[in-house]
Interface confidence: medium
Amino acid sequence: SERCDDWGLDTMRQIQVFEDEPARIKCPLFEHFLKFNYSTAHSAGLTLIWYWTRQDRDLEEPINFRLPENRISKEKDVLWFRPTLLNDTGNYTCMLRNTTYCSKVAFPLEVVQKDSCFNSPMKLPVHKLYIEYGIQRITCPNVDGYFPSSVKPTITWYMGCYKIQNFNNVIPEGMNLSFLIALISNNGNYTCVVTYPENGRTFHLTRTLTVKVVGSPKNAVPPVIHSPNDHVVYEKEPGEELLIPCTVYFSFLMDSRNEVWWTIDGKKPDDITIDVTINESISHSRTEDETRTQILSIKKVTSEDLKRSYVCHARSAKGEVAKAAKVKQKVPAPRYTVELACGFGAT
């Protein structure tokens, strides 16, 4: 057969769907690989062909579109399952071709089982809500295109196993779930079950997402440097190890890059000749506020090193701060026999 542009197995788009539920899967060619859409391709005389490789098999085979009740069908660039079965798991390929052009991509499809509490191996999207921020909403995800706007589905929301009814601060609003006030106790997995009729049959769509309550932008502050500070002086003798922690608190800020770095005499440690190492650790609070600690370490400090300026810097979307460490050379204790004796006027 003639050459075909093969984009390989697109593992970035690992598609997971629940067993015994409808699934509509768009051919990834038009979304991620080609610069034209299905309509353009179709009107140019290109044909979209689907085939698959079953789990643990190497053999590519055509998809059976003649199953009872059209269980698997193709509509434009979408492959439909009404509904899925466990053994539909495998690698699916969509190929766009005519006599002179060919392009194809494969992607993995995993049909997943869930228990009565919606637990499953499904990777869950995370939705972040700001703590104590006022009314916020989450929306039942990935249900577009399953039924026409004329169909009015029923939607039931659950937190874990429990149907959401008269919850303390959570109100179901159809496809939306409203949090009158988000609190840490609202952390958890929320599931919407969308039920709709189609051709005399009833289908269910189950969508679970994780809600994580995070720090509110109303409470966000610029980075706070806890250490170094004015109360601690790093007093060392030459030859000793110098350890200076830079500990910085960052308020949670959506999509903010938190940075901590040291400068020595105004230069980054990498740009200076002294033997310095820096170790970083990061911890998070329950609302995803972040504490970063960078420990600057000089194994055998010299008297030259003890005269240098050590400054901890921190930056977030809220601002940039810096704090110098107080470093000084320890004054050697007087040697009694000589210094003190001289002090008492001994000759």
Epitope: G134, I135, T154, P172, E173, L180
Partner: antibody, heavy 125, light 113 residues
Framework: QQLEQSGGGAEGGLVKPGGSLELCCKA??????????MCWVRQAPGKGLEWIGC?????????YYASWVNGRFTLSRDIDQSTGCLQLNSLTAADTAMYYC?????????????WGQGTLVTVSS | ALVMTQTPSPVSAAVGGTVTINCQAS??????LAWFQQKPGQPPKLLIY???TLASGVPSRFSGSGSGTEFTLTISGLQSDDAATYYC???????????????FGGGTEVVVK
Amino acid sequence: QQLEQSGGGAEGGLVKPGGSLELCCKASGFSLSSNYWMCWVRQAPGKGLEWIGCIYAGSSDSTYYASWVNGRFTLSRDIDQSTGCLQLNSLTAADTAMYYCASPGYGGYGYYGLWGQGTLVTVSS
Amino acid sequence: ALVMTQTPSPVSAAVGGTVTINCQASEDIYSNLAWFQQKPGQPPKLLIYDASTLASGVPSRFSGSGSGTEFTLTISGLQSDDAATYYCLGVYTYISPDGTDNAFGGGTEVVVK
């Protein structure tokens, strides 16, 4: 987008103490099911606004009442007719008021962007 | 039950002046507060929601601020058409099976001189 109120006749509702009355509110220019909530507020003559309750106008059965309602009033909705109703029972003279329906033109529960024209309910013997 | 206390009432100011109306919630309602304007014989009109977000079509002369239990509506560049009664509405954040409370303040009459 508007809310049209009905119930109690064109001149409003004159009801005897202990009596009942149903007020309804029809959404026109938008689908009630896509606008989520139908809420009710009343206003006694010369007084301020008083929240009665809200009913979700979609597929679930969320209904919330002010604690003072004590089961005397009932909210219902008919999605197909884009209508929400307020059933008033065991009425007393203190229930004499202008009754408004309101729906969120914004956001969902707790917002009242659209209002009906109001229906005056008079409880008198 | 949630109680919303509105002050002062009435309040008067000259055309072009500034009016500030306060609303205090008996519970922490975070930013779940709306402001309404009502003129005689008319239903209320939504001005502000989420404590500070201007509703569609409302002039920027109206502004809201506050969160928690203390809220303020400010009307600057007062116009004669602003003569009306103003109400705050708090959405309480705790729902219990025996009822939830959204509560209006008692109203503030604004007189334009």
